[in-house]
Amino acid sequence: GMEVRWCATSDPEQHKCGNMSEAFREAGIQPSLLCVRGTSADHCVQLIAAQEADAITLDGGAIYEAGKEHGLKPVVGEVYDQEVGTSYYAVAVVRRSSHVTIDTLKGVKSCHTGINRTVGWNVPVGYLVESGRLSVMGCDVLKAVSDYFGGSCVPGAGETSYSESLCRLCRGDSSGEGVCDKSPLERYYDYSGAFRCLAEGAGDVAFVKHSTVLENTDGKTLPSWGQALLSQDFELLCRDGSRADVTEWRQCHLARVPAHAVVVRADTDGGLIFRLLNEGQRLFSHEGSSFQMFSSEAYGQKDLLFKDSTSELVPIATQTYEAWLGHEYLHAMKGLLCDPNRLPPYLRWCVLSTPEIQKCGDMAVAFRRQRLKPEIQCVSAKSPQHCMERIQAEQVDAVTLSGEDIYTAGKTYGLVPAAGEHYAPEDSSNSYYVVAVVRRDSSHAFTLDELRGKRSCHAGFGSPAGWDVPVGALIQRGFIRPKDCDVLTAVSEFFNASCVPVNNPKNYPSSLCALCVGDEQGRNKCVGNSQERYYGYRGAFRCLVENAGDVAFVRHTTVFDNTNGHNSEPWAAELRSEDYELLCPNGARAEVSQFAACNLAQIPPHAVMVRPDTNIFTVYGLLDKAQDLFGDDHNKNGFKMFDSSNYHGQDLLFKDATVRAVPVGEKTTYRGWLGLDYVAALEGMSSQQC
């Protein structure tokens, strides 16, 4: 008949497994339980995937790997503490008197339960990497952490190359023995030790469990170091940058850590495994039973087959590793799991022109001289779309793209953002809001929903803020309904008249030029350059100002740039910004200063796009280390990442306006990076590409 082959990872575990198998057999529990010996949890996962074993209990990190790499699924979960159920929480604790937040951890002193421990290392480090706060080059997480914190105690890090930094706060036992040991010899080991490291002032932050502070403060029976500690003197760091009381761990934590779970192959009946184990726990989980499922004392070890603290096993309803782990823990694991042996030696960058090839070649040499990993290789392509095709085909790895190209790269080629560009806060030409500006007019006020039949002013055909976003948004919202994909005609019929300057028109609807005025002599009407006085964002605003149009689609800065004395041309000299308003998507009107809340979309910064199987943290890690050396346009290190002037071009590899490369954080998809409004506008336009 049917049998379930449990995989044991050590001799003591094999011993306990044999006893469990015997106990189950004597109790008549079906199907029968057999034991297979593996060398490690990883090995057992491989055996299960190869159908040479069927089940094993794994911790969260191992469940992630088993699910992601081998398609295994969790079917039975452990429950420990009734209050939290099948999980506990990883938190970051600080002294109330300090000013540390999750955003200011760089340079602070840190206390960890132990190297590779879940809440003391895996979750915090993974979270910091995944959220973009900590950049890792070449999968060297230890180096990254040692550079990031201003000294740490990470018990067990003594054997690493970075022990000076990672063990700097550790103190060993009372006689100074066992410094940085991953054992109770190190006074700052484990949950209570990491908290002690914070409480005694050695560190500024401790990465522990949700219950650690409450178990070690307020006069509970404790060793002398904790006798006087008060829980109210400590706070938790929340992911949003705020802080909270230590009792608020449900709302304020780094991640919910899933309980250990039994995993099996996707084709194995999870219900069958639960029924087997449920019969077992019914008979063998209480004091005095002939076999103890949730105790390892008899074998001189801890946590064999199951965690000793398990109170019961429960069936898992949604049998996917993602659902069991939860998004917080899942994200942290993504940030942490980086295998240096599987890291490609090269990052192949897509280049589009001779000047770009030259700059990329110089970048590759400069990076190599500084031993930055992975090394850059330059591969040419004919167009951004060709780059996307080559990346999808695994012939190239990365390219920097603009908003519209990011949309295509994500939607059509499945690419994802790995890093983004960041521009100076005052630089409104590279990332900006698209707004609909109207005259402040109480008697004839209309809203965004009432634009039909109005007169419209646009910077030019195909301009992001003047055409693509507003027209796309109006199509997406159902106001403009193109017939036979003819957007131009549909727009011309929606507005009463418009000025949409254009270069080389063909079949262009005249009403889209009806409001245009040309140059001072009345020539060059509607041309797509400054000879048309209503061309560009300034021109579109002038079209509104001079009462040719009722609404102007412009950048959020356009009104400010041309009012209150900022533009001395006669048409603008006397204008006041308060005489204009914005039309909001919710049907309201707002002051022009409210552009961040009242806009049609934000034009996103450019981003580096890669295949979804590329480790984005290594890409950002490389760029982050590189920009420390080459990011400043005045650096003396022989290469300027964000300057193209030496190559007789502009915006080569990156936009010249870039101040820094930034992590994508939670914006891990093309939609996330572009933002919902911008995507909606592009979808409105792309729905018309027949």
């Epitope: 008249a497 028109p505 063909k506 079949n507 005249s510």
Partner: antibody
């Protein structure tokens, strides 16, 4: 040089249908709309409608919606206009005309004379 | 539909004279007015669009002007070959509509 060569004169009976052709040359056929215009002594010039040769999309003057049907054959760079249920009022000269920078007739064919008579 | 009215069906002029042909729209057409001429036995030819922009190859004796609802085509010095029917057309809104035509006769 843009050329629009229309089919020859037609003499048809009331109630019949007719198909007038317009062969384009001297430019990329799918780049510009083709318009059709009726010229009669009674009503001077009347715009019938237009077709986008690229995708066959049409737009009609409402008064000709049930009278005319516009089609194209991209392979031969030819546009066609079918006129149905003909009456003496449909007797006229019919022009095809190519659009230009803007969406209205710029270059005209030589015209096709249609006579509807019993 | 927008109605285009050419009030003069005929205009008589002499070679070398200046002549103006007028056209009125039933509503503001934002200068989206074209002018054609049609010589006897020929098809119409585009002269002017956007009220004042001369089409390629059109002699500079032809000028257009106007705004709102009133438009004018002027021939500064009439030549014998200018004998033709002249039509205005609005290209602001479909359906495109034409004036009834003005026949220019040489005295």
């Amino acid at each position: 040089e843009v050329q629009l060569q229309q089919s020859g004169p037609e003499l048809v009976k009331p109630g019949a249908s007719v198909k007038i052709s317009c062969k384009a040359s001297g430019y990329s056929f799918t780049d510009y709309y083709l318009h059709w215009v009726k010229q009669s002594h009674v009503k001077s010039l009347e715009w019938i409608g237009r077709i986008n040769p690229y995708n066959g999309a049409t737009s009609y003057n409402q008064i000709f919606k049930d009278k005319a049907s516009l089609t194209v054959d991209k392979s031969s760079s030819t546009a066609y206009m079918d006129l149905h249920s003909l009456t003496s009022e449909d007797s006229a000269v019919y022009y095809c005309a190519r659009g230009g920078d803007y969406d209205f007739p710029w270059y005209w064919g030589q015209g096709t004379t249609l006579t509807v008579s019993p | 539909d927008i109605v285009m009215t050419q009030s003069h069906k005929f205009m008589s002029t002499s070679v070398g004279d200046r002549v103006s042909i007028t056209c009125k729209a039933s509503q503001d057409v934002y200068a989206a007015v074209a002018w054609y001429h049609q010589k006897p036995g020929q098809s119409p030819k585009l002269l002017i669009y956007w009220a004042s922009t001369r089409h390629a190859g059109v002699p500079d004796r032809f000028t257009g002007s106007g705004s709102g609802t009133d438009y004018t085509l002027t021939i500064s010095s009439v030549q014998a070959e200018d004998l033709a029917l002249y039509y205005c057309q609005q290209h602001y809104r479909t359906p495109w509509t034409f004036g009834g035509g003005t026949k220019l006769e040489i005295k």
